[in-house]
Amino acid sequence: MRTEAQVPALQPPEPGLEGAMGHRTLVLPWVLLTLCVTAGTPEVWVQVRMEATELSSFTIRCGFLGSGSISLVTVSWGGPNGAGGTTLAVLHPERGIRQWAPARQARWETQSSISLILEGSGASSPCANTTFCCKFASFPEGSWEACGSLPPSSDPGLSAPPTPAPILRADLAGILGVSGVLLFGCVYLLHLLRRHKHRPAPRLQPSRTSPQAPRARAWAPSQASQAALHVPYATINTSCRPATLDTAHPHGGPSWWASLPTHAAHRPQGPAAWASTPIPARGSFVSVENGLYAQAGERPPHTGPGLTLFPDPRGPRAMEGPLGVR
């Protein structure tokens, strides 16, 4: 079940045991260890970005952090699909992609993330306070949805933080910043622990209520405790809603997939294809609380969610046992 790190208070190194680097090598393992064994849940992230070149053009990127296989992705605007939202695109891993104006190009970026470019003017043009939602249907986790929108004062070229605007905080730090550091960090941690075998390793204690043996996972973004209230969808300015868009019915039957060319269903299969995932050129991820990244120009180490370093086509959780994690 859950494995939590009981991190002892940091002590200065004992004289003679560690060199001048002693304090650093003591602190770092505890920090990394805490991050490495923090459990998470299936999570959808959403990033909305207005293109600097075309003010009426938006790029929506969404991804799923989970162990399961994705069976369908639905992108909608104006709120979640089925709750007043209008479908913009439906992406199926085998049957292909279908999109509706003003969606210009929907595509798979990786095994677990997609991007959608929107453009338009007048009635079918999205505007800054439009809410975009992504819903990932996965097995065995089920359907998970998240929404996001551009901050009202966004400059062109700046992107909204991944996941819904009301809930930045640790999500932003965790999903964007930590995942990349973790990959390196957890490996480095093992190296450090091996080098310092003479120092007692911290004990990992399973929760007392655990119905299952403890299992640490070394990839998860840290989900620190936060006081963020989740608002699934915001009210939007109805003038920004499309006037003529038909609501899509993706489950009305498989017939509409048939007309799609077979290459439309292709998704990148190997790490090389994933590594070529385009990253927003001027994206600036702004952390509301933890000041993790500078607001202008400086970008976080962007290894996840856009880039994935896991070679297994099922994504980061594939390394775990059959049950996945919370």
Partner: antibody, heavy 119, light 106 residues
């Protein structure tokens, strides 16, 4: 000891609103997906809403989508269910449950709070 | 959504007897199946996960089995505290529950 305590239930007229709360203790609340499950008068159990540990991702079945909103305050270890446009078929006992992804099940449930929608 | 059906809807048995409750899924759910026990006036209690693994503290007289679409919960040597309702729940996708089986004392 894991504890989930629901509150906020009561009698409400059709079309009305109600907000349920679930106070959690005895575990790291911010590490778990949480769910609301209801039990109808006919004793059927139905999932009403799920929310990921960060509060970023959610799931609603079609019959409550757009009417119910699940949210959480991880600083207060509290889960919420805002219910609006209530219908008589929403009458049920509402349980808050901890969703455990190690076992793909709800391993702890609260004692429930009763919601009656009637004119 | 995947539908879960349980049978029987109710059954009567005596202390010391062995009973079996079955649960059927409308589609293959692999082994993503859990069982819950609910006593009168109480909330459901987690009993079995992964179709056959007992949750912590559950007596060994309970056993779960099956995979795919057919599952069962067997209770050997019924004890007075075992009477109540039992529900199956799949988690191959978003969870849905069976209609329940009420186990009463004969």
């Amino acid at each position: 000891e894991v504890k989930l305590v629901e509150s906020g239930g009561g009698l409400v007229q059709p079309g009305g609103s109600l907000k349920l709360s679930c106070a959690a203790s005895g575990f790291t609340f911010s590490s778990y997906t949480m769910s609301w499950v209801r039990q109808t008068p006919e004793k059927r159990l139905e999932l009403v809403a799920e929310l990921s540990n960060s509060g970023g991702s959610f799931h609603y079945p079609d019959n409550v989508k757009g009417r119910f909103t699940i949210s959480r305050d991880n600083a207060k270890n509290t889960l919420y269910l805002q219910m609006s446009s209530l219908k008589s078929e929403d009458t049920a006992m509402y349980y808050c449950a901890r969703h455990n992804w190690d076992v793909y099940a709800m391993d702890y449930w609260g004692q429930g709070t009763s919601v009656t929608v009637s004119s | 959504d995947i539908q879960m059906s349980q049978s029987p809807a109710s059954l009567s048995a005596s202390v010391g007897e062995t009973v079996t409750i079955t649960c059927r899924a409308s589609e293959n759910v692999n082994s993503y199946l859990a069982w819950y026990q609910q006593k009168q006036g109480r909330s459901p209690q987690f009993l079995v996960y992964n179709a056959q693994t007992l949750a912590e503290g559950v007596p060994s007289r309970f056993s779960g089995g099956g995979s795919g679409t057919q599952f069962s919960l067997k209770i050997n040597s019924l004890q007075p505290e075992d009477f109540g309702s039992y529900y199956c729940q799949h988690h191959y996708g978003n969870p849905t529950f069976g209609g329940g089986t009420k186990l009463e004392i004969k």
